[in-house]
Structures are given as C-alpha cells and as structure tokens.
Amino acid sequence: CPGACVCYNEPKVTTSCPQQGLQAVPVGIPAASQRIFLHGNRISHVPAASFRACRNLTILWLHSNVLARIDAAAFTGLALLEQLDLSDNAQLRSVDPATFHGLGRLHTLHLDRCGLQELGPGLFRGLAALQYLYLQDNALQALPDDTFRDLGNLTHLFLHGNRISSVPERAFRGLHSLDRLLLHQNRVAHVHPHAFRDLGRLMTLYLFANNLSALPTEALAPLRALQYLRLNDNPWVCDCRARPLWAWLQKFRGSSSEVPCSLPQRLAGRDLKRLAANDLQGC
C-alpha cells in the first residue's frame, strides 16, 4: 500500500489516499483494488496506463486535484470501471477524445468544473452503459453534432452553467433514455426545431436563465413524457410569434415555471401562460 494511502479489503478492496498533498498518482497501488480514492490532492498529470494493473477497478475518484493533462491512454485496461470522477479540476480545459474509449461499463462520469472549452469528436464514443454525465460549470460554447450519439442508456445529462449559445439539430441525437436535461444558466438563444427529436422519455427540461426570446413548439412536440419544464429568466418576446408556445403551454399538463415576457414593453414581466390569445399581437 502506498505510504500516503490506507488500504483495506472490506466491503471492497480499496486504496484510499484523499487530501494527502500528493503531486502524482502514487506507485504501488495494489493490483486488486476495486476502488481508488485520490481526490483532494495536488495531482497535475495522469500518465498513460496509470491504473493498468488494476483490472478489477470499478470506482476511481480523481476530483478536486489540479489536473492539467490526462494522457489518452490513462485509463487503458479499466474495462470494469463504473464510476469516474474527474470534477473540480479547473485547469484541465480539454480531454483527448480517446481518453474514455474502452470504458464499456462506465455508468457515471463527472467532468463538471473542469474548465472544458469544447467536447472533442468521439469523446463519449462507446460509452453504452453511461447513465449519468456531469458537464456543468465548464466553459463549453457549443454542442457538436452527435456528441452523445452512443449514450443510449444515459438518463441524466447536466450541461448547466456553461456558455452554450445554441442547440443544433443533432446535439442530442441518440439519447433515447434521457430523463433529465439541465441546460439552464447558459447563453442559449436558439433551439433547432428538431433538437429534442430523440428525447421521448425526457421528464425534466431546464432552460431557465438563457437568452431565449422564442422557442419553436416543434422542438417540444417529441417530449411526450415531459413533466417538469422551466423557462423563466429568458427574454421572451410575447407578440404573435409566441402564440404557438402559448398554445402549447395551455395544453401542457405537467409543471412549468412562469414564462415572464420581456417584450413588448406593455407586457413586460407578465407570464405568457396567463395572457389571453389576443394579447399576442403585433407582427
């Protein structure tokens, strides 16, 4: 067992080295480890094959370090890995698209608060078991087409607190099991009419605190399971262009936030849902 760590076998074979001031992944981690806790250290780099000997590893916590670089092959051989927490490593900024390849059993991936500016093509390829993906509080500006295409079992996708300005047509392709999509506190001004086409099981959609002045109801039509919708804190324009959204909200049987109008000025602050159809004039 490495000097700064505590190792024990029950309930799972565990190597625990949190908050020890470690500046590198320690050598001598027992090959039988099923859980490795390295959070709260000063580790800046995860070299290739750092954990290759740990074939039984299911949980790896590397959050709250100072990671600036993760080699593409850092997690090679971890075919049984189920939880990977890389959150709160603000200097990371980018992740090689091959980093998570081969993690076919991974069900939870934490990449929040990592300073990520983009999601490289194929970053999440092959993660068919993934259920929870945490990408909130980064610096993402765009959602590339088909980024999440292989994530057919994903149920929770957290994208809030980024700088995303639009939701393109293919951003959420393949997310057939998604239950919760959090897109609040971004800069979303446009949602493609077909952006949510695959989200038939979505129950919760948060779009509050964005730059939306309109939302095509064609985008909402596929959301047959939707129960919770938050649209507040957007600059909604409540003229004739809002009539389709107004009509959709009248029929919506789930729980929705207020939708306060910003324009026209005579309707500023009033809830779109509570307006009469003939209030929505002027086109």
Partner: antibody, heavy 121, light 107 residues
Framework: QVQLQQSGPGLVKPSQTLSLTCAIS????????AAWNWIRQSPSRGLEWL???????????DFAPFVQSRIAVNPDTSKNQFSLHLKFVTSEDTAVYYC???????????IWGRTMVTVSS | DVVMTQSPSSLSASVGDRVAITCRAS??????LAWYQQKPGKAPKLLIY???TLESGVPSRFSGSGSGTEFTLTISSLQPDDFATYYC?????????FGGGTKLEIK
C-alpha cells in the same frame, strides 16, 4: 417632469469595475410600467443597448449577450435610482454611457441621462 | 441579433428641403421601431415610435412610415434646428439594437 441624473467616475482603470448610478425624479424605479435601461455610445461601435431592470411584482433584468457575463443592473428603491456595474473593463468600454427610461406603451426610450467614461491607466 | 442598416450614412440638404432617411431591419420587426435625433454632446431625443407615431412635442414636419423590414423617416421641410444625426432603433427582439446613424448636414 421626469428627469434622469447620472453620477459616477469619469475615469476607470483597465480590469476594474465601471460603476454608474442613475437617479430618477418624477417617476419611480419600482413603477409597474416603466423599465430602466443602460445604453452606451462610442465612435467605433455606435449606440449599444447594454441592459435594463424593471419591476412587475418582482424584479426582472435583461442584458445584451455581449456583456452578459460582466454586467449587473441593480435598482435601489430607497434612493429611487438604479446602477450599472461593468466588470473587467478595457479601453473598448470607453464610451458615453446613458441611462434611459422605457415607458409603458412600446415607445422606445423617451427620457435620457448622459455621462462620459474613459477607461485608461 | 437584428441588424439595423441606415442609409444614407450622411446627407447634405438645404433649409426647406424634403429629406428621407431609410432604415432596414435584417428580419421582420413589425412596427416596433423608434427614430431619434442627436446633436453633438447631447443624448438622443425620441422623435417617433411604433414606426409612425409622433412623440409629444415633436414638430409635425417629422413623419415615419414602414413595417416589417423597411422604414422611412421623412422631414417635409428642413429647418435649421434639424441638422443633426438620426438613428433608428428596433425593440421587437433582444438584444435591442440601433442603426449606425445618418448625419444630416447643411449643404
């Protein structure tokens, strides 16, 4: 007669926060019909709307996307005024800054105040 | 953003002339358009709102027309006080945006 009187430093250092106040007379910042705006003008960028605050049973804010990450517009009901705070300023933020009222019936900006702000070390 | 394009950018005319300034929106803005007059060292002054409604106290020689994407400010008979810069502004969409201005000068 509604009037807007601006106050604040005319010179701000780069990377600091630009803070301006607009005092309202003849109307109320918590009026249920008006909105209170900040606009700026420079030779290179022309007239630019920055953001606004208004009260309709609760306070609302709207901001221009290009300044959204560094702007705050705050009402002060006790002094009947509202303020602009623009963080991390650069020379690009050198401009004439206006506060302006947006009256209730979709009329544009009918009352304006004015002050010049230079960003320089 | 809705881009407001004014033409011409400058215009020389004489007292008594009839002049027209055009403002084009990059997308439809209904009649949510205002016109302003600005003189050096002063704040803009509201002339017209809702494309064609004259602001209280503004002389009737000023008029506005248009809807959708094409708008015009007309001054029927120029007076010495009218030489200034004129701006259009849309308030149909966020962010609110202004035209680049038309400077009206004495010929």
């Amino acid at each position: 007669q509604v009037q807007l009187q601006q106050s604040g430093p005319g010179l701000v250092k780069p990377s600091q926060t630009l803070s301006l106040t607009c005092a309202i007379s003849g109307d109320s910042v918590s009026s249920n019909s008006a909105a209170w705006n900040w606009i700026r003008q420079s030779p290179s960028r022309g007239l630019e709307w920055l953001g606004r605050t208004y009260y309709r049973s609760q306070w609302h804010n709207d901001f221009a996307p290009f300044v959204q990450s560094r702007i705050a517009v705050n009402p002060d009901t006790s002094k009947n005024q509202f303020s602009l705070h623009l963080k991390f300023v650069t020379s690009e933020d050198t401009a004439v800054y206006y506060c302006a009222r947006d009256p209730p019936d979709d009329q544009g900006f009918d009352i304006w105040g004015r002050t010049m702000v230079t960003v320089s070390s | 953003d809705v881009v407001m394009t004014q033409s011409p950018s400058s215009l020389s005319a004489s007292v008594g002339d009839r002049v027209a300034i055009t403002c084009r929106a990059s997308q439809g803005i209904s009649n949510y358009l205002a016109w302003y007059q600005q003189k050096p060292g002063k704040a803009p002054k509201l002339l017209i709102y809702k494309a064609s409604t004259l602001e209280s106290g503004v002389p009737s020689r000023f008029s506005g027309s248009g809807s959708g994407t094409e708008f015009t400010l007309t001054i029927s008979s120029l007076q010495p006080d009218d030489f200034a810069t004129y701006y259009c502004q849309q308030y149909s969409n966020y962010p609110l945006t202004f035209g680049g201005g038309t400077k009206l000068e004495i010929k």
